[in-house]
């Protein structure tokens, strides 16, 4: 009679995490008498997965009834598969011996690969805000997937980005893998409403990629443009000067009026108007009593935006062009954009 062979017909088996793996094994003969054992790996470290004779293997069930005398099917099912179960599984026939059974013949092995979904991509931007024309880096991370092959793409407002670097770790074999990508994005003044999207495609996702997003409103700082203008004379001795603060983001802004270098008033932007592109405009007035000044007045609108160094715009008020009243009030009157002063 021909010598017993252990047949493992499947060179490899691919199973999704959480599912059951079936590892097939048949023997070509009933002789010699002795049990079958299943191992993961070979050599000194091989791990016992199932022993027909003894032991407790809660995740393993046999496909056929191994107690039947003429049984030659030693296939097993392993339940609730995780990426940690990946490896090469060997079906090994033992010959009954005394005191111990002796290994007789091994199957060729079945490589179990586990498909595991990647975690939802997490996109993070720079710690500090940056201004238009600057390049900022965004990172995207996703973990726990298997097999290793994965595709990652970056988009800004639906347009695919090309300036990025991606690493999949580890390089060698592993139960599961992680992906880390860094994309470079050039900011524009119109990016307050923009989004950066990281898209991950993997065999486990069946063509429905996972996406992570970051809003550029968290990253961008659009500095304001200032314009100081002198309004027509409101009363005989009063001049209304306005400071238009335009196209800034975020809203955090503090404005200080200086008269000849001396602080006149400080206020915080409150009632702002929003532009279509997400930036803000704001206006502040200063009502100057020109009769209080003998010489020309240098008015400065100084703006501190989002904790950055102050920017300013000045306007020279020609006092000589206005009649002076003797003994008039020497203090300048100031008002905000939504205040009214009655004299």
């Amino acid at each position: 009679e021909e010598e017993l062979q252990v047949i493992q017909p499947d060179k490899s088996v691919l199973v999704a995490a959480g599912e059951t793996a079936t590892l097939r094994c048949t023997a070509t003969s009933l002789i010699p008498v002795g049990p079958i054992q299943w191992f993961r790996g070979a050599g000194p470290g091989r791990e016992l997965i199932y022993n027909q004779k003894e032991g407790h293997f809660p995740r393993v069930t046999t496909v056929s009834d191994l107690t039947k005398r003429n049984n030659m099917d030693f296939s097993i099912r392993i339940g609730n598969i995780t990426p940690a179960d990946a490896g090469t599984y060997y079906c090994v026939k033992f010959r009954k011996g005394s005191p111990d059974d002796v290994e007789f013949k091994s199957g060729a092995g079945t490589e179990l690969s586990v498909r595991a979904k990647p975690s939802a991509p997490v996109v993070s931007g720079p710690a500090a805000r940056a201004t238009p024309q600057h390049t900022v880096s965004f990172t995207c991370e996703s973990h726990g997937f298997s097999p290793r092959d994965i595709t990652l793409k970056w988009f800004k407002n639906g347009n695919e980005l090309s300036d990025f670097q991606t690493n999949v770790d580890p390089v060698g074999e592993s139960v599961s893998y992680s992906i880390h990508s860094t994309a470079k994005v050039v900011l524009t003044r119109e990016d307050v409403h923009s989004q950066v999207i990281c898209e991950v495609a993997h065999v486990t996702l069946q063509g429905d990629p996972l996406r992570g997003t970051a809003n550029l409103s968290e990253t961008i700082r659009v500095p304001p443009t200032l314009e100081v203008t002198q309004q027509p004379v409101r009363a005989e001795n009063q001049v209304n000067v306005t400071c238009q603060v335009r196209k800034f983001y975020p809203q955090r802004l503090q404005l200080t009026w200086l008269e000849n270098g001396n602080v006149s008033r400080t206020e915080t932007a409150s009632t702002v108007t929003e532009n279509k592109d997400g930036t803000y405009n704001w206006m502040s007035w200063l009502l100057v009593n020109v009769s209080a000044h003998r010489d020309d007045v240098k008015l400065t609108c100084q703006v501190e935006h989002d904790g950055q160094p102050a920017v300013s715009k000045s306007h020279d008020l020609k006092v000589s062009a206005h009649p002076k009243e003797q003994g008039s009030n020497t203090a300048a009157e100031n008002t905000g954009s939504n205040e009214r002063n009655i004299y």
Epitope: Q37, F39, R40, G41, A42, G43, P44, G45, R46, E47, L48, I49, G55, G87, V92, F94, D100, E103, D169, P170, V171, G172, E173, S174
Partner: antibody, heavy 117, light 108 residues
């Protein structure tokens, strides 16, 4: 938590015998390969012997025929019977759990064997 | 028998710097290479297996790379607790399993 505790080390004369034990806990002992790795004073690591989950045994050439590895799965204990000891066997002997992929994921603290006349 | 040669024997590095350790195998080990850390008076500790898979609880500053016969362990931003001896081990051929001679990482 996986724990491996070696015992049985000591000072012996060349040619004498010693038996080391390794008590294991925190995992299903019978399912895993176990190994002995030694380290001579001031030297590197040297694999000595291993016993697979099925009881198959493996030895380094330097100890083959002199050392015998065995295990008692009912007691969760690994043994190393060392006969015909030589001065060059002087080392700390570590018990280690072997993964299915043949590296060592857990180690005991070791037991010192000194062979000296 | 697969012979593993580690270099350098000793590496002097300042805390915060990067350490690069090399392990060369006498034949292809198919990526089956592990790294261990051993501090004085202590047992070895598994850091990395299969070239680059970090063991449970090992910080990300430890990374492994390489293929074929040449492998590298990189420690970025060395911390005081990282000064130790590092060993490589091939887990491709178990007859016998072999270790490299070790690299001592010491404070510069």
């Amino acid at each position: 938590d996986v724990q491996l505790v070696e015992s049985g080390g000591g000072v012996v004369r060349p040619g004498e015998s010693l038996r080391l034990s390794c008590a294991a806990s925190g995992f299903t002992f019978r399912n895993y390969g176990m190994s002995w790795v030694r380290q001579a004073p001031g030297e590197g690591l040297e694999w000595v012997s291993a016993s697979s989950g099925s009881g198959s045994t493996y030895y380094a050439d330097s100890v083959k025929g002199r050392f015998t590895i065995s295990r008692d799965n009912s007691k969760n204990t690994l043994y190393l019977q060392m006969n015909s000891l030589r001065a060059e066997d002087t080392a700390i002997y570590y018990c280690a759990k072997v993964t299915w992929n043949n590296f060592f994921d857990y180690w005991g603290l070791g037991t010192l064997v000194t062979v000296s006349s | 028998e697969i012979v593993l040669a580690q270099s350098p024997d000793t590496l002097s590095v300042s805390p915060g710097e990067r350490a690069t350790l090399t392990c060369r195998a006498s034949q292809d080990v198919a990526g089956k290479l592990a790294w261990y850390q051993q501090k004085p008076g202590q047992a070895p500790r598994l850091l990395i297996h299969a070239t680059s898979s970090r063991a449970d609880g090992i910080p990300a500053r430890f990374s492994g790379s390489g293929s074929g016969t040449e492998f590298t362990l990189t420690i970025t931003g060395l911390q005081s607790e990282d000064f130790a001896v590092y060993y490589c081990q091939q887990h491709y051929d178990w007859s016998p399993l072999t270790f490299g001679g070790g690299t001592k990482v010491e404070i510069k």
